[in-house]
């Protein structure tokens, strides 16, 4: 089934933007001027979900790359990482569990619960050019909390 | 305080075409996506499409190809072009506000305008 | 397409009365329903969000219930400026948003 997608960025309540750090790693700095083509452009898509009043299920990709963040366990730890898909078939409506998230939405922030590890979120550290991560912990030292930007093609 | 004011109704002749606008105050449309929604005279709410950024626009499967939804973030304007107008596309037309994104429901309207398809 | 239906289409009532609207989907749509009301010459007014979630300002005796295919609009008690157009709507099935065929609520 079709879904509904769209272009946007993100950055964090610092106002810190998301730019790719390797092939498989973004990392969260903040950026001015021309540099800000460089943060990373995601394909935001609604996906089918648990029912919630207040969540909203999403997978996130990565514009025009068949790249998606997606949560696994490494180590025994719940894990961000960037995903290689087969873009023939995604995005989809029904994505597995890995790669959703709940958007979580609080006067205009934005949080992403993973789905597979309820109570673990998109994060990054107060600290510049360190990698975005999935943590268990909100409200204390690391960022949970995201604002979106539509991107014009 | 959200307000969004449609624009550019009147009265057009069959196959002809008109461009509706809506402005809005209070928000961004940089991060919020807007539908357009019309009610003949007399009958009920149907949904036209709905836009994110200027690529993701979305539309109901009658409106596809006849109806397009444009914006222009800067002059904080949504806009519905209509093609190939027909008696029965006479209608009011409104524009709203999803509430969140991907949400689906519409927490913000305009007050509408009317489109008159007649010879 | 997911097609919504309501019902009754019309409805008379009078003021203190208990209201149920219903609203079914052709198929499953989770809780991803929404109520609104219209008044004549007006825009419509978001009362709920996913079937039971009440917007911000709505009076507590508007309440919504159920998930899947079926869903119910409640009126505890109806008050005289209760009396509307109330429209059911998918909001998640696809990429189409649909809404029911509305229900007119007039005075008994």
């Known amino acids: 089934a079709p879904v509904r997608s769209l272009n946007c960025t993100l950055r964090d309540s610092q106002q810190k933007s998301l730019v790719m750090s390797g092939p498989y790693e973004l990392k969260a700095l903040h950026l001015q001027g021309q540099d800000m083509e460089q943060q990373v452009v995601f394909s935001m898509s609604f996906v089918q979900g648990e029912e919630s009043n207040d969540k909203i299920p999403v997978a996130l990709g990565l514009k025009e790359k068949n790249l998606y963040l997606s949560c696994v366990l490494k180590d025994d730890k719940p894990t961000l990482q960037l995903e290689s898909v087969d873009p023939k078939n995604y995005p989809k409506k029904k994505m597995e569990k890995r790669f959703v998230f709940n958007k979580i939405e609080i006067n205009n922030k934005l949080e992403f619960e993973s789905a597979q590890f309820p109570n673990w979120y998109i994060s990054t550290s107060q600290a510049e050019n360190m990698p975005v991560f999935l943590g268990g912990t909100k409200g204390g030292q690391d960022i949970t909390d995201f604002t979106m930007q539509f991107v014009s093609s | 305080e959200v307000q969004l004011v449609e624009s550019g109704g009147g009265l057009v002749q069959p196959g002809g075409s008109l461009r509706l606008s809506c402005t809005v105050s209070?928000?961004?449309?940089?991060?919020?996506?807007m539908s357009w929604v019309r009610q003949a005279p007399g009958k009920g709410l149907e949904w036209i499409g709905i836009i994110y950024d200027s690529a993701s626009t979305y539309y109901a499967s009658w409106a596809k190809g006849r109806f397009t939804i444009s914006k222009d973030t800067s002059k904080n304007t949504v806009y519905l072009q209509m093609n190939s107008l027909r008696a029965e596309d006479t209608a009011v037309y409104f524009c709203?506000?999803?509430?969140?994104?991907?949400?689906?429901?519409?927490?913000?309207w305009g007050q509408g305008t009317l489109v008159t398809v007649s010879s | 397409e997911i097609v919504m239906t309501q019902s009754p289409s019309t409805l008379s009532a009078s003021v203190g009365d208990r209201v149920i609207i219903t609203c079914q989907a052709s198929q499953s749509i989770d809780n991803w329903l929404s109520w609104y009301q219209q008044k004549p010459g007006k825009a419509p007014k978001l009362l709920i969000y996913?079937?039971?979630t009440l917007a911000s300002g709505v009076p507590s005796r508007f309440s919504g219930s159920g998930s899947g295919a079926e869903f119910t609009l409640t009126i505890s008690s109806l008050q005289p400026d209760d009396f509307a157009t109330y429209y059911c709507?998918?909001?998640?099935?696809?990429?189409?948003?649909?809404f029911g065929q509305g229900t007119k609520l007039t005075v008994k």
């Open positions: 709507q998918n909001t998640g099935g696809g990429v189409s948003i649909a």
């Open positions: 709203a506000r999803e509430r969140q994104i991907f949400s689906g429901d519409m927490d913000g």
């Open positions: 996913r079937a039971s």
């Open positions: 209070g928000f961004s449309l940089s991060s919020y996506a």
